[in-house]
């Protein structure tokens, strides 16, 4: 039975040209996290973080994505095209797969604030 819950940073906004941290957290389960996949709204992979083998950053993002903090991902040099949904997929044993959603809005305005609160989708 899957008892865990994915908490995410929810809906966040950040300034064009700036950076943002995409973060998910799995709680309420003793399951072992074997791998976390980060994907964009169009199903393109940004990164994979295997518990033992470390990070894999996809070549399309290698100049703009930094691993971490933790199992999260830092997206840099933001463009307007980065606006959209991002998904963290936690592969766990023995529970199976958990998925969290983050919506990022990239703003032209200099008043854009990066909210870092955690939300349960």
């Amino acid at each position: 039975m899957m008892t865990g819950t994915i908490e995410t940073t929810g809906n966040i906004s950040a300034k064009k040209g700036g950076s943002v941290i995409l973060q998910c957290h799995l709680s309420s389960t003793m399951a072992q996290v074997t791998q976390v996949n980060w994907e964009q709204h169009d199903h393109s992979l940004l990164a994979i973080r295997n518990a033992e083998l470390g990070w894999h950053i996809y070549p399309a993002f290698k100049d703009r994505v930094a691993p971490g903090p933790g199992l999260g991902l830092t997206l840099q040099s933001l463009t307007m095209n980065d606006t959209g949904e991002y998904f963290c997929t936690y592969h766990t044993y023995p529970d199976g797969t958990y998925r969290g959603r983050i919506f990022l809005e990239v703003l032209e305005s200099s008043v854009a604030e990066h909210s870092a609160r955690f939300q349960i989708p």
Partner: antibody, heavy 119, light 107 residues
């Protein structure tokens, strides 16, 4: 230049164990995970598992779980693969292979080690 | 485990002609696919990574495409030195798996 040099061919009896070494040079050994891939004669490739030399953390193909042990010796930049309870179908070539940095692709391979299991 | 099914098993192509190898994953692996070339008595060599990126030093006659479950390796103009076995490989989730291989020969 990067080199992965494996130990020589081995002949073992069923039920025995074999330990294959992979001595590396030309790169920072602890910064790249090392993997083992095997290939039966004239057959395809099979991933056995990988090890993070920095932490010693391992990930195994469940097919080999309990029979394979991956270790490293950081002082000599050498990786090891030990396979126990050998069977005749373990008569294959074993390769070590390192990953690219921050990418899950094998960019350098050892020359291969043939292990023959025969009574 | 994700099964990678390659087709055809073998392929005979005239020098200078196009060779096309297909790989089908049993489930969606996004673009987490590489292609390797293996010549007799040698270890495999990386050709294509992330489905479509050519590895350093690989001739531009080699190209890769696809995402999800269907992937293709194309040799646009076959050369004698391209005679080898080609393998696809997925790393979307462990255990990482390879296709059964496609042997490319000269017709």
């Amino acid at each position: 230049q990067v080199q992965l040099v494996q130990s020589g061919a081995e002949v073992k009896k069923p039920g025995a164990s074999v330990k294959v070494s992979c001595k590396t040079s030309g790169y920072a050994f602890t910064e790249y995970t090392m993997h083992w891939v095997r290939q039966a004669p004239g057959q395809g490739l099979e991933w056995m598992g990988g090890i993070n030399p920095n932490t010693g953390g391992t990930t195994y193909n469940q097919k080999f779980q309990g029979r394979v042990t991956l270790t490293v010796d950081k002082s000599s930049s050498t990786a090891y693969m030990e396979l126990s309870r050998l069977r005749s179908d373990d008569t294959v070539v074993y390769y070590c292979a390192k990953l690219l940095r921050l990418m899950y692709y094998f960019d350098y391979w050892g020359q291969g080690t043939l292990v023959t299991v025969s009574s | 485990d994700i099964v990678m099914t390659q087709s055809p098993d073998s392929l005979a192509v005239s020098l200078g002609e196009r060779a096309t190898i297909n790989c089908k994953a049993s489930q969606d692996v996004r673009t987490a696919v590489a292609w390797y070339q293996q010549k007799p008595g040698q270890p495999p060599k990386l050709l294509i990574y992330s489905a479509s990126y050519r590895y350093t030093g690989v001739p531009d006659r080699f190209s890769g495409s696809g995402s999800g479950t269907d992937f293709t390796l194309t040799i646009s103009s076959l050369q004698a030195e391209d005679v080898a076995v080609y393998y696809c490989h997925q790393h979307y989730i462990t255990p990482w798996t390879f296709g059964g291989g496609t042997k490319v020969e000269i017709k």
